[in-house]
């Protein structure tokens, strides 16, 4: 996982990286495998009904440094992990949703059963 403190500009990989993709497969992917000059990622986030949804795929080098940094977004529970160490490395990434803060109960929508 990339650490929050990293700020160096990403250097281009000498070769293409293949990643598993799920719910996030571009048109040029084949058999749920995409290719990139950047990173593989796996992300977990809550959908509109509060259920966790896992997506995975490829991030291009441009902007991926920021996207992989996993900065918290208010009122959105989401976590992303990125990797480059081998092809399909994101199969082994298992990000978890950040814990609910107390204010999320107050500020968030009220779901009636």
């Amino acid at each position: 996982k990339k650490e929050d403190g990293e700020s160096t500009a990403p250097t281009p990989r000498p070769k293409v990286l293949r990643c598993k993709c799920h719910h996030h497969c571009p048109e040029d992917s084949v058999n749920n495998i995409c290719s990139t000059d950047g990173y593989c990622f796996t992300m977990i986030e809550e959908d509109d009904s509060g259920l966790p949804v896992v997506t995975s795929g490829c991030l291009g080098l441009e902007g991926s440094d920021f996207q992989c940094r996993d900065t918290p977004i208010p009122h959105q529970r989401r976590s992303i992990e990125c990797c480059t160490e081998r092809n399909e490395c994101n199969k082994d990434l298992h990000p978890t949703l950040p814990p609910l803060k107390n204010r999320d109960f107050v500020d968030g929508p009220i779901h009636h059963r």
């Epitope: 000498p14 293409v16 571009p26 048109e27 040029d28 990139t36």
Partner: antibody
Framework: EVQLVQSGAEVKKPGESLKISCKGS????????MQWVRQMPGKGLEWMGE????????LYNQKFKGQVTISADKSISTAYLQWSSLKASDTAMYYC?????????WGQGTTVTVSS | DIVMTQSPDSLAVSLGERATINCRSS???????????LHWYQQKPGQPPKLLIY???NRFSGVPDRFSGSGSGTDFTLTISSLQAEDVAVYYC?????????FGQGTKLEIK
């Protein structure tokens, strides 16, 4: 200087097995994929598949999947293309080629002739 | 699979004249990263192919500046601005955007 040196020409009979090689030098062997490309006599180029020597990850052209096996030994910077049972239609020139995002260097080619 | 179609199949051009080879792909070659992985190779008899142009318009090291590439999306062109005797060869376009990677059928360039 980047060099890809392939093994010599082969003459085989149908049904025989074969493994041809491609040795890379002058660069970091694990920093690039190695591809294999077929050129049948008087014909064009066909991509067969590729291997990432750093993790042995392979991708095949569906046309060649199950027909050939691509492997690599990073300790000796060598990639391989092998057949378990050759057919007359495998007669062709086979090239290895270094691939990052495009092929930039090619081996000299290995001629494989399969005839009874 | 992406079909790469070159035109013409063969071409005869006088020394010093311009040669133009076209390549059309059956789908866009713009990759999801924004790059277009369309390349041109030259193959002389009895030799392996050589890279001339990568990613549409970038000349590979050591390639003379009379070779240039252009195009976008599905339509691409290789131009030799002033044909030399040593340019007699078969030229192939190739895409590495979509697996399986594919080549054009080749264009045979001769001297008129």
């Amino acid at each position: 200087e980047v060099q890809l040196v392939q093994s010599g020409a082969e003459v085989k009979k149908p049904g025989e097995s074969l493994k041809i090689s491609c040795k890379g030098s002058g660069y970091s062997f694990t920093s690039y994929w190695m591809q294999w490309v077929r050129q049948m006599p008087g014909k064009g180029l066909e991509w067969m598949g590729e291997i990432d020597p750093s993790d042995q990850y392979t991708l095949y052209n569906q046309k060649f999947k199950g027909q050939v096996t691509i492997s690599a030994d990073k300790s000796i910077s060598t990639a391989y293309l092998q057949w378990s049972s050759l057919k007359a239609s495998d007669t062709a020139m086979y090239y290895c080629a270094r691939f990052g995002y495009y092929v930039d260097y090619w081996g000299q080619g290995t001629t494989v002739t399969v005839s009874s | 699979d992406i079909v790469m179609t070159q035109s013409p199949d063969s071409l005869a051009v006088s020394l010093g004249e311009r040669a133009t080879i076209n390549c059309r792909s059956s789908q866009s070659l713009v990759h999801s990263t924004g790059n277009t992985y369309l390349h041109w190779y030259q193959q002389k008899p009895g030799q392996p192919p050589k890279l001339l142009i990568y990613k549409v318009s970038n000349r590979f090291s050591g390639v003379p500046d009379r070779f240039s590439g252009s195009g976008s999306g599905t339509d691409f062109t290789l131009t030799i601005s002033s044909l030399q005797a040593e340019d007699v060869a078969v030229y192939y376009c190739s895409q590495s955007t979509h697996v399986p990677f594919t080549f054009g059928q080749g264009t045979k360039l001769e001297i008129k």
